[in-house]
């Protein structure tokens, strides 16, 4: 019972932190303008992995993709890799733990492939728990270097009065969305490997019996069966078919350029 | 079609006050800010403030801070700016106008000239 | 403070000739997260309100004649007109839309010659 809760818990917390994985990859705000100085600002900024964006005082919203590939800095594309990699494993490992699940019965499946699955899927998670968190933790990284760089050269002059001001980026609610969800996705993983060592059968060690038949003297040990503990190799050998994790585009609604009455 | 439309002409002593109306009317008045303006005889533009309709929030110029008050009444469409504690210096045009995209003003009231004179 | 300041204060041109009016900021307008700068140039004929002509620097606001074009990008700005006529006679402002407090310049006027 135990097991089956474990299990069970490890397959929803999982699935919440590779939500808000999926959340965080298509958020817009991994960055935001610093309004330490003003808090109050006409025009805020705001940078996510796919498209940057700016909402005016007004009330509008405009964004722009960063339509390059190789313009962009290779830090960003690791992030993205990082996320995108999270992402599918994590989708795999959700869709191996449900096969796994001690509470669904599929056909004859014994213990032993349900641990191995069980197994196979939390390690999925936890691989997936720790991209996420690498990914937002190297973008974490980059924006505060950045951030000591442009408060070095905030102001640069540029023939006496005119001056440049450098706009500065903090960290943004897409960042704490993904530590937090890939401190999930890895807890949930954790909680998979704990409740496959309880799914696997114990080596059941039965007393030898002697059976003393009339003539000769033989003895039968019906030896102690090793049941797979999921750490061995998959005796069923049974695929696993990816059925493709896709992310529904983002919702986000802004206000109208043309609201006219 | 879009319209501002703003009270008439005011004189008025130093040391009173005077409030400034300002009617939307043809778009939806709670989703747009709405500025006002000043301009002095013979000078240039000078921004006041804004003030959004929905949660009467405002971005005051810190210039006018202690001189104009901002307020919206939502059910006639209507923005007001009181000025108080006037002065010859007060003696100006004052305008409403929407905020548009790029922070643009794209509709404006046809003024409001307050002068002050004793 | 950002200090817009157009050059020239006033400017005489003949029917039918080119225009061109200068703004410089004291600070970059141009936003980050849309690459947009946020300048925009108003006219205005005495007795009337302002009238918004291009906002973002160089879009046309809808019904201004395509012979008003803006142009540049951080802290200096261009506005242009192409083929001057009688009823572009009047004052023309920039302001700045990019943080608060906004800023006009102090203004141009357009004359004919």
């Known amino acids: 019972m135990a097991v089956t809760a474990c299990q069970g818990l490890g397959f929803v917390v999982s699935l919440i932190g590779i939500a808000g994985i999926i959340a965080a990859t298509c958020m817009d705000q991994w960055s935001t303008q610093d309004l330490y100085n003003n808090p109050v600002t006409a025009v805020f900024n705001y940078q996510g992995l796919w498209r940057s964006c700016v909402r005016e005082s007004s009330g509008f919203t405009e964004c722009r993709g960063y339509f390059t590939l190789l313009g962009l800095p290779a830090m960003l594309q690791a992030v993205r890799a990082l996320m995108i990699v999270g992402i599918v494993l994590g989708a795999i490992g959700l869709l191996v733990s449900i096969f796994a699940l001690k509470c669904i019965r599929i056909g004859s499946m014994e213990d032993s492939a349900k641990a191995n699955m069980t197994l196979t899927s939390g390690i999925m998670f936890i691989v997936s728990g720790l991209c996420a968190i690498a990914g937002v933790s190297v973008f974490a990284n980059m924006l505060v270097t950045n951030f000591w760089m442009s408060t070095a050269n905030m102001y640069t002059g540029m023939g006496g009065m005119v001056q440049t001001v450098q706009t500065r980026y903090t960290f943004g609610a897409a960042l704490f969305v993904g530590w937090v969800a890939g401190g999930l996705t890895l807890i949930g993983g954790v909680m998979m490997c704990i409740a496959c060592r309880g799914l696997a059968p114990e080596e059941t060690n039965y007393k030898a019996v002697s059976y003393h038949a009339s003539g000769h003297s033989v003895a039968y040990k019906p030896g102690g069966f090793k049941a797979s503990t999921g750490f061995g190799s998959n005796t069923k050998n049974k695929k696993i078919y990816d059925g493709g994790a896709r992310t529904e585009d983002e919702v986000q609604s802004y206000p109208s350029k043309h609201d006219y009455v | 079609q879009v319209q501002l439309v703003q009270s008439g002409a005011e004189v008025k002593k130093p040391g009173a006050s005077v409030k400034v109306s300002c009617k939307a009317s043809?778009?939806?008045?709670?989703?747009?800010?709405v500025n006002w303006v000043r301009q002095a005889p013979g000078q240039g533009l000078e921004w006041m403030g804004m003030v959004h309709p929905s949660g009467s929030e405002t971005r005051l110029n810190q210039q006018f801070k202690d001189k104009a008050t901002l307020t919206v009444d939502t059910s006639t469409s209507t923005v007001y700016m009181e000025l108080s504690s006037l002065r010859s210096e007060d003696t100006a045009v004052y305008y409403c106008?929407?905020?548009?995209?790029?922070?643009?003003?794209?509709?404006w009231g046809q003024g409001t000239l307050v002068t002050v004179s004793s | 403070d950002i200090v817009m300041t157009q050059s020239p204060d006033s400017l005489a041109v003949s029917l039918g000739e080119r225009a061109t009016i200068n703004c410089l900021s004291s600070?970059?307008?141009?936003?980050?997260?849309?690459?947009?700068?946020?300048l925009t140039w108003y006219q205005q004929k005495p007795g009337q309100p302002p009238k918004l002509l291009i906002y973002w620097a160089s879009t046309r606001d809808s019904g201004v004649p395509d012979r008003f074009t803006g142009s540049g990008s951080g802290v200096d700005f261009t506005l242009t007109i192409s083929s001057v006529q009688a009823e572009d006679v009047a004052v023309y402002y920039c302001q700045n839309g990019f943080s608060f407090p906004f800023t006009f310049g102090q203004g141009t006027k357009l004359e004919i010659k």
């Open positions: 106008a929407r905020v548009w995209s790029g922070n643009a003003f794209d509709y």
């Open positions: 600070q970059s307008l141009l936003a980050s997260g849309n690459q947009r700068n946020y």
């Open positions: 043809g778009y939806s008045f709670t989703n747009y800010w």
